[in-house]
Interface confidence: medium
């Protein structure tokens, strides 16, 4: 089994449409389950989390530039959700997000209908079939959700969306 | 709550450059854009640039373009300001400011500031 | 660039009498979105710079009801409706709709 999401960082704007790719093959003939699973930035003391809140664990962790502290953390340092789930033909949203235009299309793209305020973050495609267990099952992509900004205004003018009021 | 402590103050000579930093706490870092705002004794207010850490892109007002670079360091979620060149005039207070993604432009937290001194 | 015009430069203020500042920008902050990129800060007395108001009209978490910020365009206002000792300070205005972001000249609002 192996799972490739091809664009790892995914910049998309606010109450616009997005779709979030993810690519398997397998050498089983048995339908896969296909799940995508939200996970949120981390917080700030999720270095506490990870046992980094000594000098020496810091310095450790400065040296190991494959750590993302936006992004390395214990689940239970952040939100954890299950956006959607297929399994054949059924496609069935996880209870957070029921309501909303999400589905999973061509076997397991991701497609969202109107990006909402919270669901910039980190998202994993995980595959998982039957009779296919080696290699590797799962990869993620990180989504940023912008609204229309001056600051980003001449530099990125398709950012060109409404924004909402808290 | 969220806080931007900044680094202290500086004397420095004309010609010489200056860095300051701006360290957050008490949010994700990476739902922020960050603005360098400063305030010359006895004026008003004037934005630099900003910085939006989880896209790594900068940007700066022209009439400080060449000599303002910003930058952000995820790991320590601090942000930085170098002002090069400096002259009598860049003597001031510089503002750290923080606006919450996915707009980013309005600032809902101020670090304390850090009053830059040019002299000879 | 933009260029904020705010007025008056200074306003004395009886406490629990209402107070208005103008702000005026050079061209239209009304973005096609409905939206006025404007917002409105406060800087007390020896502190840092605090929001107010953004996008025109929405008041920033923890701001008192007396404070309200209305308008559209080029021409916007923000309004005290009772003034308190605490309002003191200088009051800014700022467009967020193109960089570089540009602040009025500011509003000293003092206690009569």
């Known amino acids: 089994l192996q799972v490739t999401v091809p664009d790892k960082k995914k910049v998309a704007m606010l109450f616009q449409p997005t779709v979030l790719r993810c690519h398997f093959s397998t050498s089983s003939h048995q339908p896969a389950v296909v799940q995508w699973k939200f996970k949120s930035y981390c917080q700030d003391r999720m270095g506490e989390s990870l046992g980094m809140s000594s000098p020496r664990a810091q310095a450790l962790s400065k040296r190991n530039l494959e750590w993302d502290p936006y992004l390395d953390c214990l689940d239970s340092r952040r939100t954890v959700r299950v956006v959607a789930s297929k399994q054949g033909s059924t496609v069935t949203l996880g209870d957070f997000y029921r309501g909303r235009e999400i589905t999973i299309v061509h076997d397991a793209d991701l497609q969202i209908g109107k990006l909402m305020w919270g669901d910039s973050g980190l998202y994993y495609c995980i595959i998982t079939t039957p009779d296919d267990l080696e290699g590797k099952n799962e990869d993620s992509v990180e989504l940023l959700v912008l609204g229309r900004t001056g600051l980003l205004a001449d530099l990125l003018p398709s950012f060109a969306v409404e924004i909402m009021p808290e | 709550q969220v806080q931007l402590v900044q680094s202290g103050a500086e004397v420095k000579k004309p010609g010489s450059s200056v860095k300051v930093s701006c360290k957050a706490s008490g949010g994700t870092f990476s739902s922020y854009a960050i603005s360098w705002v400063r305030q010359a004794p006895g004026q008003g207010l004037e934005w630099m640039g900003g910085?939006?850490?989880?896209?790594?892109?900068?940007n700066y007002a022209q009439k400080f373009q060449g000599r303002v670079t910003i930058t952000a360091d995820k790991s320590t979620s601090t942000a930085y300001m170098e002002l090069s060149s400096l002259r009598s005039e860049d003597t001031a207070v510089y503002y750290c400011?923080?606006?919450?993604?996915?707009?980013?432009?309005?600032?809902?937290?101020w670090g304390q500031g850090t009053l830059v001194t040019v002299s000879s | 660039d933009i260029v904020m015009t705010q007025s008056p430069l200074s306003l004395p203020v009886t406490p629990g009498e209402p107070a208005s500042i103008s702000c005026r920008s050079s061209q239209s902050l009304l973005y096609s979105n409905g939206y006025n990129y404007l917002d409105w800060y406060l800087q007390k007395p020896g502190q840092s710079p605090q929001l107010l108001i953004y996008l025109g009209s929405n008041r920033a978490s923890g701001v008192p009801d007396r404070f309200s910020g209305s308008g559209s365009g080029t021409d916007f206002t923000l309004k005290i409706s009772r003034v308190e000792a605490e309002d003191v300070g200088v009051y800014y205005c700022m467009q967020a709709l193109q960089t570089p972001l540009t602040f009025g000249g500011g509003t000293k609002l003092e206690i009569r």
């Open positions: 400011a923080r606006g919450r993604l996915p707009y980013g432009d309005f600032w809902d937290s």
């Open positions: 910085i939006i850490p989880i896209l790594g892109i900068a």
